[in-house]
């Protein structure tokens, strides 16, 4: 799809990154068999895929997570994939909820999110989990991504 | 998308296969409500999709399985989307994970993986799970895909 | 993809509704950040995502549920993506199933579907689950969509 | 820090078999290729065999070929080598090594990590 200069396609798949910081906000990197189709998606600060042109894209993530019932707090580990447009205040488009293990000394799950959405020129989406000391970095485990329609 | 003569559309799913073989790769089979669109994209010997034009990529699998924490390996049940290219070895692109159930004689659960990948001629995707024999084949349970972009 | 008056863009994405029914077929809104590309692909009965246009279609939905393994049925909960096209019965394109979690008062899960499938003209697609009253309707976490290859 | 400890090697009568064990660590296992390396006393170093990084394409040495069969458990983290109807002339100190290569090749200078190796004894 997208075929043509004046259309071209516009992808990118990111691979999760560890972080130390302490924020909310997981951290991906252009490593291991990532995708970057062009200069129309770039990934920002290592935290958001930034799009340039209007349209409808399917964004989607995966976050794999290992956490147990007795060390974590009562509420489940969620992942939300939020959204950025410029001049507005950020917003949720998915999220996914799994309650954590009783497995010891953590159990590990997948949660995958996926949907279309309209994005403007210069919107932002990016991926915000409960507790991202929980997250998994093995290969493959998290990964971020986008294709335009 | 991929519209014309020279741009055909190029996609396919396809649908799990009880094997008694002891293989971790899934094997799959052409039947219920599949897809495949042409002989640009084709599935060999039931257990891998392979593509014919160089190109980006969705792909995603879902994989449902029944397992029980007492009866199995303390090891997560996982499910692995892996590449394999011409002259290259095998590489994985995507994983999940989920703890076996406590439940008896075993619990179901469910995992889907997806992304966007760049595959070149002749390139090959399949599905590969720690334990075979615990794959749920059930009308619409476990599948595989992919989408030319 | 499909650009041009000839060949637009098709894709839907549409926000759970709670319901008073008792039906297992989940109930969707065009509310929040939802989309409806052109009238190619209509929202019917807040039940059923309809298209106009034969093609290839990637369908995906994602549904969050609590459940209690004491307060539920034996039988996992079980979410069905159906299809149903004109003259024809409905039937299953795909299906995940999660056992019933063991935190109280309920644990939340998330379940993700998703495929390519041809559609006739006049095909509806539909989100079945086993215990609707289950479903989470927090922003982001039951979803459902399709967008055109 | 990647890892590599050989085990399982010693002392067998011609026609006898070992099995040789490397656990690894410091790396994610799966990512890579591995393979098995030898040096018999007074001579150069051989390769034997190699194994994909899911075990799905394994390579040997013809010296090797049908006596020898290399395996891997990721979940394990560890390699193996399968060693039947051994000869004198297997004698050797075994190595195991990771392989930075994406395609096979059985030069040597594509591992570019190893063990401290293991010695094999073949003789009555």
């Known amino acids: 799809m997208q075929k043509g200069d004046q259309n071209p396609q516009i992808a990118a798949h990111v691979i999760s990154e560890a972080s130390s910081k302490t924020t909310s906000v997981l951290q991906w990197a252009e490593k291991g068999y990532y995708t970057m189709s062009n200069n129309l998606v770039t990934l920002e600060n290592g935290k958001q895929l930034t799009v340039k042109r209007q349209g409808l894209y399917y964004i989607y993530a995966q976050v794999t997570f290992c956490s147990n019932r007795e060390a974590s707090s009562q509420a489940p580990f969620i992942a939300s994939l939020c959204l950025k447009s410029p001049g507005r205040f950020e917003r949720i488009l998915l999220r996914a909820a799994n309650t954590h293990s009783s497995a010891k000394p953590c159990g590990q799950q997948s949660i995958h999110l996926g949907g279309v959405f309209e994005l403007q020129p210069g919107a932002s989406v990016f991926v915000n989990v409960t507790d991202p000391s929980q997250v998994s970095h093995g290969t493959g485990f998290t990964s971020f991504g986008l294709l335009k329609l | 998308m991929q519209k014309g003569d020279q741009n055909p559309q190029i996609a396919a799913h396809v649908i799990s296969e009880a094997s008694s073989k002891t293989t971790s790769v899934l094997q799959w089979a052409e039947k219920g409500y599949y897809t495949m669109s042409n002989n640009l994209v084709t599935l060999e010997n039931g257990k891998q999709l392979t593509v014919k034009r160089q190109g980006l990529y969705y792909i995603y699998a879902q994989v449902t399985f029944c397992s029980n924490r007492e009866a199995s390996s303390q090891a997560p049940f996982i499910a692995s989307l892996c590449l394999k290219s011409p002259g290259r070895f095998e590489r994985i692109l995507l994983r999940a994970a989920n703890t076996h159930s406590s439940a008896k004689p075993c619990g179901q659960q469910s995992i889907h993986l997806g992304g966007v990948f760049e595959l070149q001629p002749g390139a090959s995707v399949f599905v590969n799970v720690t334990d075979p024999s615990q794959v749920s084949h059930g009308t619409g349970f476990t599948s595989f895909g992919l989408l030319k972009l | 993809m499909q650009k041009g008056d000839q060949n637009p863009q098709i894709a839907a994405h549409v926000i759970s509704e709670a319901s008073s029914k008792t039906t297992s077929v989940l109930q969707w809104a065009e509310k929040g950040y939802y989309t409806m590309s052109n009238n190619l692909v209509t929202l019917e009965n807040g039940k059923q995502l309809t298209v106009k246009r034969q093609g290839l279609y990637y369908i995906y939905a994602q549904v969050t549920f609590c459940s209690n393994r004491e307060a539920s049925s034996q039988a996992p909960f079980i979410a069905s993506l159906c299809l149903k096209s004109p003259g024809r019965f409905e039937r299953i394109l795909l299906r995940a199933a999660n056992t019933h979690s063991s935190a109280k008062p309920c644990g939340q899960q998330s379940i993700h579907l998703g495929g390519v499938f041809e559609l006739q003209p006049g095909a509806s697609v539909f989100v079945n689950v086993t215990d609707p009253s289950q479903v989470s309707h927090g922003t982001g976490f039951t979803s459902f969509g399709l967008l055109k290859l | 820090e990647v890892q590599l400890l050989e085990s399982g090697g010693g002392l067998v009568q011609p026609g006898g078999s070992l099995r040789l064990s490397c656990a690894a660590s410091?790396?994610?296992?799966?990512?890579?290729?591995m393979g098995w390396v030898r040096q018999a006393p007074g001579k150069g170093l051989e390769w034997v065999s190699t194994i994909s990084p899911m075990g799905m394409g394994t390579y040997y040495a013809d010296s090797v070929k049908g006596r020898f069969t290399i395996s891997r458990d990721n979940s394990k983290n560890t390699l193996y080598l399968q060693m039947n109807s051994l000869r004198a002339e297997d004698t050797a100190v075994y190595y195991c090594?990771?392989?930075?290569?994406?395609?096979?090749?059985?030069?040597?200078?594509?591992?570019?990590?190893w063990g401290q190796g293991t010695l094999v004894t073949v003789s009555s």
């Open positions: 410091g790396f994610t296992f799966l990512d890579y290729a």
């Open positions: 090594a990771k392989s930075s290569a994406i395609s096979f090749t059985s030069d040597i200078s594509n591992f570019d990590y």
